[in-house]
Each structure stands twice: as structure tokens, then as C-alpha cells.
Interface confidence: medium
Amino acid sequence: LRHVVYWNSSNPRLLRGDAVVELGLNDYLDIVCPHYEGPGPPEGPETFALYMVDWPGYESCQAEGPRAYKRWVCSLPFGHVQFSEKIQRFTPFSLGFEFLPGETYYYISVPTPESSGQCLRLQVSVCCKERKSESAHPVGSPGES
């Protein structure tokens, strides 16, 4: 399964911070960065860095300390940018992350200094089974971006 999350401030549940996505092992979390046609919004485009953090970092929406891992940067608002995280128990890649069944992982985005964006937060709950099917379940929507 591929779970698509449109990561932008038009997504009310990401804004509130109580969004939950459930993923199984071998699923993919696809993060779609904000994308603008033309000049973009008058307040400027949203750009940010996405981090995996611990619970205190999630609660405070702060990506600081040894348990904050920068995952991706959404810095090209006029391009089509998407990142993928494979939910796997073991990863062969040095930049990959290893996920444990039954655990919850926390993602936040921190707006860049020039950005109009707000703090966005997502909880990823990893389930127990390995899955092999390939269908899409998006979370959020392209919104106004």
C-alpha cells in the first residue's frame, strides 16, 4: 500500500496535530510537497523541512536534540516534489529508518524562515503485518496549493 499525504497547511488535521496514518510493514508513506502554479499565494509559498521526532518534539513542534532526524526538505514550491518513506523493519540504506511493528512515529514540519507555512504534524502508527498489495490511500488533499 502507498499512503499519500498532501503536506500543506490546507490540511486541517495536520494543522491541528491529531492526524494519524496507519501503515503496515512494506507500505510506503508518500509525502507530497506544496506545489503552486503561477505566482503562488500573496503571503508567499510554503517551504519547510520535515523531521521525524520523539513525542516531546511532536508536542512542542520542535526539531531539536539528538532524537530529531531531518528526513526531507520541501523547498521547491514551483516544482512537483514528492518523497517516500518505506516502512520496513530493516533498511539497507544509511539514510533509511527502521520501523518497529506496534510503534508510533512522529513527523513534523518546521517552516523555513522565509516561509508562510505553519507547523504541521503527523503520527504514523505501524501495524504488525507485512503487506504486498499496491493501492493508494491519500491523506489530506492538494488543497489550495
Epitope: 496535530g17 496507519e22 491519500p138
Partner: antibody, heavy 112, light 107 residues
């Protein structure tokens, strides 16, 4: 345009059951978390539960497992199954998608 | 469950007034508080999330503040369309709970 339309309300006797529907358009029900909220006449808001995009649910434990949230992806519709209804369950029931979009509500009256 | 105590329960004010509604949580909820506006016979409308952030399209006269246990919703200059009932909600812990509401009436 996102729209939620509740239906299925009406008069039911104490101890009876009712299933409310929340038909969604403008988005797919596997996309958002959808919450159910109720409001007794002249009273405040009470959260009943949520069904997440992945299909899992969380409930208000005060309901004592009498209410169940489900959905039919093919119909893009959510459901609130209510059992062992009591007079105090009389309320307008709303579904809300990510707290941004709400249905118009459907009135449930529990009375003999 | 976390109790949300809202005050006052009703309030009379005039167009142009500055109005403050308060909400107190029975335990620390961080900034996981939202505010809603509801008009008679209508569904609630989201105003504020994360204690102090306005949703898109909400007028700037609405502002929220607070963290921990004490929260406020302020309307800086009341407009005729603002007369309604306002609810706070915590979403730190299940079950999500609402305050009892504040009915804002025309003086």
C-alpha cells in the same frame, strides 16, 4: 466541493437501534479522518468517535460500546450504528471531516 | 476524561466591543485546543486550532492564546455576524472534550 450529508435520524423507542449515514462527496472517505459529534437539544457538543483514513476507530468510552463507526468505501459513506438507545441519546448527530467540513446534522429522538 | 470549563456561559455585548472567552482544562493539554463558532440551527465552524492559529478564511479579529490549562478566545471588535455560541475543545487525549459553550448575545 467537499460535502457531508447525514441521514437516518428519526424517532426510536428506548432500547432500540438506529444506523445513521454520512454520505461524503468531494473527497474519498479513505482520505480523511471523519468524526461524529452530537448535540442534545439546547446543550453543548459531545464527541462520539473518529474513523481514520486507514479504517481504525477511536471512541468516547462514555458510550460503553453502544456505538460503532464504520464505512463503505465503495459508497463513500460513513455510518454510526447506535444500539441500546436511551432517552439521553436524543440529539442532533453530526459527521465532520477533519473538523473543517460538517454535515447539516440529523435529529435522533429516543422516546416511547 | 479531561474536563473543559468555559466561562462565562453567556455574555451580552455590543457591536465594536472587545470580548474575551476563557476555557480551563482540568489537566495540562499543551496547546491542543480548538475553538468553534456555532449559530442556531447550524453546524459548528472551526475558528482556531493549536490554541492560537486561525484557520484559513477566519477574520483576524478572532485570536486565541494560552497553553497548559488556561486558554482564551478574543474577538477584538465584535461584528453583527459574530453573535453566536462559542465552544472550546481539547484534543490532547481521548475522548476529545468540549467546553459547555459561551452564548454571545447582543446587548
Amino acid at each position: 466541493e467537499v460535502q457531508l450529508v447525514e441521514s437516518g435520524g428519526g424517532l426510536v423507542q428506548p432500547g432500540g437501534s438506529l444506523r445513521l449515514s454520512c454520505a461524503a462527496s468531494g473527497f474519498t472517505v479513505t482520505t480523511y479522518g471523519v468524526d461524529w459529534v452530537r448535540q442534545a437539544p439546547g446543550k453543548g457538543l459531545e464527541w462520539l468517535g473518529v474513523i481514520w483514513g486507514g479504517g481504525s476507530t477511536n471512541y468516547n468510552s462514555a458510550l460503553k460500546s453502544r456505538f460503532t463507526i464504520s464505512r463503505d468505501n465503495s459508497k463513500n459513506t460513513l455510518y454510526l450504528q447506535m444500539n441500546s438507545l436511551r432517552a439521553e441519546d436524543t440529539a442532533v448527530y453530526y459527521c465532520a471531516s477533519d473538523w473543517a467540513y460538517w454535515g447539516q446534522g440529523t435529529l435522533v429522538t429516543v422516546s416511547s | 476524561d479531561i474536563q473543559m470549563t468555559q466561562s462565562p456561559s453567556s455574555l451580552s455585548a455590543s457591536v465594536g466591543d472587545r470580548v474575551t472567552i476563557t476555557c480551563r482544562a482540568s489537566q495540562n493539554v499543551g496547546t491542543n485546543v480548538a475553538w468553534f463558532q456555532q449559530k442556531p440551527g447550524k453546524a459548528p465552524k472551526s475558528l482556531i486550532h493549536s490554541a492560537s492559529y486561525r484557520y484559513s478564511g477566519v477574520p483576524s479579529r478572532f485570536s486565541g492564546s494560552g497553553s497548559g490549562t488556561d486558554f482564551t478566545l478574543t474577538i477584538s471588535s465584535l461584528q453583527p455576524e459574530d453573535f453566536a455560541t462559542y465552544y472550546c475543545q481539547q484534543y490532547k487525549r481521548y475522548p476529545y472534550t468540549f467546553g459547555g459553550g459561551t452564548k454571545l448575545e447582543i446587548k
